[in-house]
Every structure is written in structure tokens, then in C-alpha cells.
């Protein structure tokens, strides 16, 4: 279904590593910072599947959710665990895996648009010849079976870094994911400030390149907290 | 250095429309699309529209769908917001950002709409 593949597709913010610098590989994608849209999905992050700390649902890939390891554990240890199947028991939304949602405490299908921040995406056929408009009939259709670029090409929907080219990452556009640049020395890159918030960036960078970080330009540390720009710096 | 420049905000009565538009200036480079965003005081900025020129798409946010639609002309830089039957709870400041290939995303100024009851 569309709302599953949408859900699949998207990336949301991530930490860096514990130990790893923000703007590493593993913090697969940046983002510019404050941009909100209404949803009650959660979302992908890096494609390995190692145990992952966390405090929230939020900074778990889109198959997992945050939760104590061990029934009645300490609340305190989180990791990021397996998103529970289809009539699996859960307590919230973020329990049950892309495509589902929480009803009643079991995952159930999502397939009828459920949430009421539902983005609707319009999939446009033509380019109108009026300003160039994306002025198409609109129909709804997954979108794997349409790739409008070569796969791994800048700008090739893609689900995952490893389905792009060399010096690409996979990053978030709108609702799907695009083949966009890795960051080079000096590009302006995102550090994620604001924790906790729910809130999925719409426009994502990737990560900065190897040997790179994503660290304040120096001559902006006077500038005030919601201001500051960073950039890939070497290490 | 690109500059997101906006016009069309105002103050109308509930039930009318207004026409925001946003045009790149100084770009050098390709954009992937561009969206519209809106901050009501005290609130959080949220998505409204979006237009992707790489997908071929729009998008729109449930509350203003049907009654807002997006486009734009990716030639001259320019995306445009048509906001027709409009609410006093479409009162808001609006902005345009744009989703850029040299991977800073831009943000213009924001302009004010305000509907009235």
C-alpha cells in the first residue's frame, strides 16, 4: 500500500553513535532543523541492525521502537527492539511495524489512512506546459513501481545509501527518499538540537564525508543558539 | 547567495483567497523541490504544501487539502501558493524553503496571512 511504502521510505533524526561524532556514516542523514509536519508514524534511520541506545521511539529505525530489553526492566536501559507484526499486543503506535497502527492494544492494518496527520501525496503523470506545473491527474500507486531516474543517480528514488552511487547517500524528500551528495569540507550540514521533538524534517542532507564532521563554523559561535551554522569540518 | 523572496501575504476575510509566491534568486545550482511552511504564534512550524520537481509531485497537509494547491516553474525559480476558502485557523506566518542540490536548504523571510472571522 501506498501508506506502507511511504512509511518505508522515509528517515527520520538520529543522534549520532554513542562515542561517534555527529555528521559520521553512521548517522546516516542530516536535516535541516524546525521543520514539522502532523504524523503519528515513526521512522527509518541507518541500515544496520545493531542494538541501538535510545530515550525515545523517535531516534529507532522504521521496523523497531524504543523499549526497556527485558519485561519490567530498568527504564532507564533502552534499546531499540523489533517492531511487533500484525495482530501482535502493543501499548502505542510505534510498537507495530510500518503499515500498521495501534487499536486496542494489537496491531492492526493502517491501510485505510488512519492517521489523522496523513500527508496525501498526489502523483502527477505529466508536466503541464503552464509554467510547468505539475498539473497531472492525480492517482494513488506505490511508489516502487515507478523510478523516474537511474537507479543510484543523484535524484533516484532510492530506500537505502546502498542503493546509490558512489558519494551519495539516501536521503528524505517530502515523503520518499532521493539519492542526493554526501557533504563535502565546508557544506553547511546539521547538528540535531532539538531532542525529543517528534517533528520529521522534510528537506534532509546527508552525512559530511569521510574524514569529515559536522562541527560549528568558528565564526559563528558568537551567533545566538537557533542561529549557529554548521559546516564538515576536518577532524 | 540564493535569497527566498515572498509576496502575496495580507489580511483577507474568512472565505477568501490570497496567492503567495517565492522566487530563488542567486541560485547557481538545482533545487529538488520546494514546500510551503506556516508558524501560527505559539505553535510549532508545520508543512502545508510541497512541490518536488526531481519526483514529479505535490504534496499536501490534510488541513489544507482541496482547498490550497501548490505549483511552480522550476525554470525561474519561482513556486506559488494558491490558499482559497480560507479559515481563521489558516492564520499564520508562511514561509517557502527550498531543497537544494549544494545541500543547504534555504528559507525565506516569512510573510503574514491573517484571516479574520
Known amino acids: 500500500t501506498l501508506n506502507s511504502v511511504l512509511n518505508s521510505n522515509a528517515i527520520k533524526n538520529l543522534p549520532p553513535p554513542l562515542g561517534g561524532a555527529a555528521g559520521h556514516p553512521g548517522s546516516a542523514v542530516s536535516a535541516a532543523p524546525g521543520i514539522l509536519y502532523p504524523g503519528g508514524n515513526k521512522y527509518q534511520t541507518i541500515d544496520n541492525y545493531q542494538p541501538y541506545p535510545c530515550a525515545e521511539d523517535e531516534e529507532c529505525g522504521t521496523d523497531e521502537y524504543c523499549a526497556s530489553p527485558t519485561r519490567g526492566g530498568d527504564a532507564g536501559v533502552q534499546i531499540c527492539l523489533a517492531c511487533r507484526k500484525r495482530r501482535k499486543r502493543c501499548m502505542r503506535h510505534a510498537m507495530c511495524c510500518p503499515g500498521n497502527y495501534c487499536k486496542n492494544g494489537i496491531c492492526v492494518s493502517s491501510d485505510q489512512n488512519h492517521f489523522r496527520g496523513e500527508i496525501e501525496e498526489t502523483i502527477t503523470e505529466s508536466f503541464g506546459n503552464d509554467h510547468s506545473t505539475l498539473d497531472g491527474y492525480s492517482r494513488r500507486t506505490t511508489l516502487s513501481s515507478k523510478m523516474y531516474h537511474t537507479k543510484g543517480q543523484e535524484g533516484s528514488v532510492c530506500l537505502r545509501s546502498s542503493d546509490c552511487a558512489s558519494g551519495l547517500c539516501c536521503a528524505r524528500h517530502f515523503w520518499s527518499k532521493i539519492c542526493k551528495p554526501v557533504l563535502k569540507e565546508g557544506q553547511v550540514c546539521t547538528k540535531h538540537r532539538r531532542k525529543g521533538s517528534h517533528g520529521l524534517e522534510i528537506f534532509q542532507r546527508c552525512y559530511c564525508g569521510e574524514g569529515l564532521s559536522c562541527r560549528i563554523q568558528k565564526d559563528h559561535h558568537q551567533a545566538s543558539n537557533s542561529s549557529r551554522l554548521h559546516t564538515c569540518q576536518r577532524h | 547567495e540564493v535569497q527566498l523572496v515572498k509576496s502575496g501575504g495580507g489580511l483577507v476575510q474568512a472565505g477568501g483567497s490570497l496567492r503567495l509566491s517565492c522566487a530563488a534568486s542567486?541560485?547557481?545550482?538545482?533545487?529538488?523541490?520546494m514546500g510551503w511552511f506556516r508558524q501560527a504564534p505559539g505553535k510549532e512550524r508545520e508543512f502545508v504544501a510541497g512541490?518536488?520537481?526531481?519526483?514529479?509531485?505535490?504534496y499536501y497537509a490534510d488541513s489544507v487539502k482541496g482547498r490550497f494547491t501548490i505549483s511552480g516553474d522550476n525554470a525561474k525559480n519561482t513556486v506559488y501558493l494558491q490558499m482559497n476558502s480560507l479559515k481563521p485557523e489558516d492564520t499564520a506566518v508562511y514561509y517557502c524553503?527550498?531543497?537544494?542540490?549544494?545541500?543547504?536548504?534555504?528559507w525565506g523571510q516569512g510573510t503574514q496571512v491573517t484571516v479574520s472571522s
Open positions: 542567486g541560485r547557481t545550482f538545482s533545487s529538488y523541490g
Open positions: 512541490i518536488s520537481w526531481t519526483l514529479g509531485r505535490t
Open positions: 524553503a527550498s531543497d537544494e542540490s549544494d545541500a543547504y536548504n534555504y
